[in-house]
Interface confidence: low
């Protein structure tokens, strides 16, 4: 039979890792397999037989592993041995680079390059490299054989310059054992230099200069060169030495400055490896005491508004505030003191808080007093413009120009205007002392005219505030003119007469002229004299007249201004038809009867029949009421004969009857002569 | 006229919360360090807590590191003091201020640190 190791010889491990020896055989059924070393040491490893196999696995690596290891096999009466040798190692890591500190253009610099855990270190070598330049190598083969596992490291000193920025520090590691594969054998580590430039020149410029005035303003601006750049710090060395740190940008402004912030003030260029300073110092002069109060020497207050006075000390830290009235009055408002300002705040003012107000300022020993004047006034509205009517070409018209609620009215100027013409100005300078809000009013009349159409009635109202003020205060109101012409020429066409036969067409046609345009309406005279309304068009159209149509038809022509009125009478005439002529009781009665004749036309008024009675010496027109003829105790020389006509422009029609009366005592009758 | 106007202040309960607000105007805000400081009843200012101009550095004392938390909005002018887990012995006075110590700060009546007129802040155990 045969017997075969794997690896075969000759191995390498590294310490930690797993590592299985094979020993099989060939040409035997079941062998029996035995380990040992070469010194008989422990195995330090673990045995799994199976079959024809026994494997031999070290888990894990250690130093106790270093041996030849011989594997015995026996098949029956025969036996084989082989043997192979186990070399370890350690290289676990790649190299470290250490820095005794950062990188300072200038200043020297130690790097370390570590090699951890290296076993064997005699077997080590470490290159250290900047960019492609080799800095330092060593081979470590001079050291003692020692079984443990140890760091190594080499060490280099150098100073970096600016090019050094952006360039590769490289520590490469090799491990010199033949049966290693190149990966293992060596291992490198890459670090780019981060150079530093520690602050230097650092540098103020101060505008607009280092002496300043108490409230006027400095800016300082601080320059300091570095890698990184630096970034900057104002302070401000107090009285012990501390820096009161005031700003983080490169600009620091100071403003309202005081003498107190006379002083040295530092710049500091500070980055990740060092600082730099420059100093400047401030010196602030004194600037006189001086009292302010605003709004001004003067403040107009309007009735009601709220007023705050405020007294403001210049130049003084810590100042002491008081406030009266001219007159000692009582001060009507809230005094709130706030540093170097005191406010006095009148609410809602009224006539009693017109004075003079002083604000007295101590500083120190010195007192200093300023005032102010408030004057108070009242002028909340615009002018309100009344007309007495519209107006209307030529008729004179009032109007009122009013200003409500005024105060003070003896400086009030009111001003009423045509267009660019004044037509009137009132000033109001007669009421003096006197504290109340009053309505003034200017009133006048003028004329209008057509021309007036178009311009602006303007009232103009100045409040003059004495001498406070150039300006004076104003209000306006303004009113456009429109001016009314009343209605006038009112002219009526009939077509095509106003005398119609009936059943004929007629059109009445109305026109008037006025501003606004005139509105027409059409009526018609009733017999008691009033007006019943028509029509509203300017044509009134009958398309058949009737004999009711006839009658009086007014027009008349409307607007805001007036009325002009034209009438015309309308007369349809008619053709007599149906005359009936009738005679009551009988057309023979008894001297004595009552006898009634009556006459009637279908289509004619009665007022146009005509009752006759017929005689030798002419006829003779009866009086006739509503058409009828009375004869309340007939007489012989009533009987005859009755004739009724009817009669117009158009034509006429006839009727006739014979009456006859008999007499009492001979009861016989008697007959008109003709 | 440099103006600072704090707010936010009030009482509370030991263990609560408040947040200080400071509006600033009268100077270029967004250029200067900021502070918030506090005046116990009886006692002197005390530094609390500084920034630096974009917020991106911040200091505390250290009897507040932990539990207050400054910031700033340069758009608003406005500087904040978000305070935790108060304590009795933080009741005072407290005031913004320009300018910033990292571990002490004075204000002299007479320096270039314009401070506003304070929020009470008072805790209660």
């Known amino acids: 039979f045969k017997i075969e190791i794997s690896p075969e010889y000759k191995t390498i491990a590294q310490i930690g890792d797993s590592m299985a020896l094979t020993c099989s055989t060939t040409g035997c059924e079941s062998p029996l397999f035995s380990w040992r070393t070469q010194i008989d040491s422990p195995l330090n490893a673990k045995v799994r037989t199976e079959g024809s196999k026994s494997v031999l696995t070290m888990e894990p690596v250690s130093f106790e592993n270093e041996h030849s290891y011989l594997c015995t096999a026996t098949c029956g009466s025969g036996k084989l041995e082989r043997s192979i040798h186990v070399d370890i190692y350690s290289f676990p890591k790649d190299p470290e680079i250490q820095f005794s500190g950062p990188l300072e253009v200038g200043k020297p610099v130690t790097v370390k390059c570590l090699a951890p855990d290296i076993y064997p270190v005699y077997r080590l070598e470490i290159d250290l490299f900047k960019g492609d330049q080799l800095m330092n190598r060593q081979e470590f083969s001079s050291e003692e054989m020692t079984k443990s596992l140890e760091t190594k490291s080499l060490e280099v000193t150098f100073t970096p310059v600016i090019e050094d920025i952006g360039k590769a520090l490289v520590c490469r590691a090799k491990l010199h054992i033949d049966q290693i594969d190149s990966t293992l054998k060596e291992r490198e580590t890459v670090k780019e230099l981060q150079v530093y430039i520690s602050p230097r020149n650092t540098t103020i410029s101060v505008h607009p200069s280092t002496r300043l005035q108490e409230g006027g303003a400095v800016t300082m601006t601080c320059s300091s060169e570095g890698l990184p750049a630096p970034e900057i710090f104002w302070g401000r060395k107090l009285d012990n030495e501390v820096l009161q740190l005031l700003s983080g940008n490169a600009t620091l402004t100071l403003i309202a400055m005081r003498m107190e912030d006379s002083g040295v003030y530092v710049c500091e260029g500070v980055n990740l490896i060092g600082r730099d300073k420059a100093e400047v110092e401030l010196v602030v002069q004194e600037k006189p005491f001086i009292v302010d109060i605003s709004p001004g020497s003067q403040v107009a207050a309007q009735v009601g508004d709220s007023v705050v006075l405020t007294c403001a000390a210049i130049g003084c830290d810590s100042p002491s505030f008081s406030w009266r009235t001219q007159t000692d009055s009582p001060l009507n408002g809230v005094v709130r003191n706030e540093g170097a300002k005191s406010t006095l705040v009148l609410s809602s003012v009224g006539f009693e808080d017109e004075h003079s107000y002083l604000c007295a300022v101590t500083c120190l020993q010195r007192t200093l007093e300023k005032r102010t004047q408030v004057e108070v006034y009242s002028f909340p509205e615009d002018p309100v413009i009344k007309m007495s009517g519209p107006l209307v070409h030529g008729r004179p018209v009032t109007v009122n120009c009013t200003v409500p609620n005024v105060y003070p009215f003896d400086h009030l100027e009111i001003e009423l205007l045509k267009g660019e013409t004044t037509l009137m100005k009132k000033y109001f300078l007669e009421e003096m002392g006197i504290k109340s809000l009053e309505t003034k009013i200017l009133e006048t009349t003028f004329i209008p005219t057509i021309e007036d159409t178009g311009k602006s009635l303007v009232c103009l109202a100045r409040l003059h505030s004495g001498e406070m003020e150039s300006e004076p205060k104003q209000r306006q109101s303004v009113q456009p003119l429109y001016v009314n012409v009343a209605p006038k020429e009112t002219t009526i066409w009939v077509s095509p007469s106003p005398i119609l036969e009936e059943g004929s067409p007629v059109n009445l046609t109305c026109s008037s002229d006025g501003i606004p345009a005139p509105k027409i309406l059409w009526s018609r005279q009733l017999n008691n004299g009033e007006l019943q309304p028509l029509s509203e068009n300017t044509t009134l159209t009958f398309m058949s007249t009737k004999r009711d149509d006839s009658g009086i038809y007014v027009c008349e022509g409307i607007n805001e201004a007036g009325i002009s009125r034209k009438s015309v009478e309308l007369i349809i005439q008619v053709s007599p038809k149906d005359i009936q002529l009738t005679v009551f009781p009988s057309k023979s009665v008894k001297e004595g009867d009552t006898v009634i004749i009556s006459c009637t036309c279908g289509n004619v008024p009665e007022t146009w029949i005509i009752l006759k009675k017929k005689a030798k010496t002419g006829d003779m027109v009866l009086k006739s009421v509503d058409g009828s003829y009375t004869i309340r105790q007939a007489q012989l020389q009533d009987a005859g004969i009755y004739e009724c006509e009817s009669k117009t422009e158009v034509g006429s029609q006839l009727r006739s009857l014979t009456l006859d009366v008999k007499g009492k005592e001979h009861n016989k009758d008697y007959f008109s002569p003709e | 006229q440099v103006q600072l106007q704090e707010s936010g202040g009030g009482s509370v309960q030991a263990g609560g919360s408040l947040r200080l607000s400071c509006t600033a105007s009268?100077?270029?805000?967004?250029?200067?360090?900021m502070s918030w400081v506090r005046q116990a009843p009886g006692k002197g200012l005390e530094w609390v807590s500084g920034?630096?101009?974009?917020?991106?550095?911040?200091y505390y004392a250290d009897s507040v590191k932990g539990r207050f938390t400054i910031s700033r909005d340069n758009a608003k002018n406005t500087l904040y003091l978000q305070m935790n887990s108060l304590k009795s012995e933080d009741t005072a006075l407290y005031y913004c201020?320009?300018?910033?110590?990292?571990?002490?700060?004075?204000?002299?009546?007479?320096?270039?640190?314009?401070k506003g007129q304070g929020t009470q802040v008072t805790v209660s155990s």
């Open positions: 201020a320009t300018g910033s110590g990292r571990d002490s700060y004075d204000c002299y009546s007479g320096s270039w640190c314009p």
């Open positions: 009268g100077f270029t805000y967004s250029s200067y360090y």
């Open positions: 920034i630096n101009v974009d917020g991106s550095n911040t």
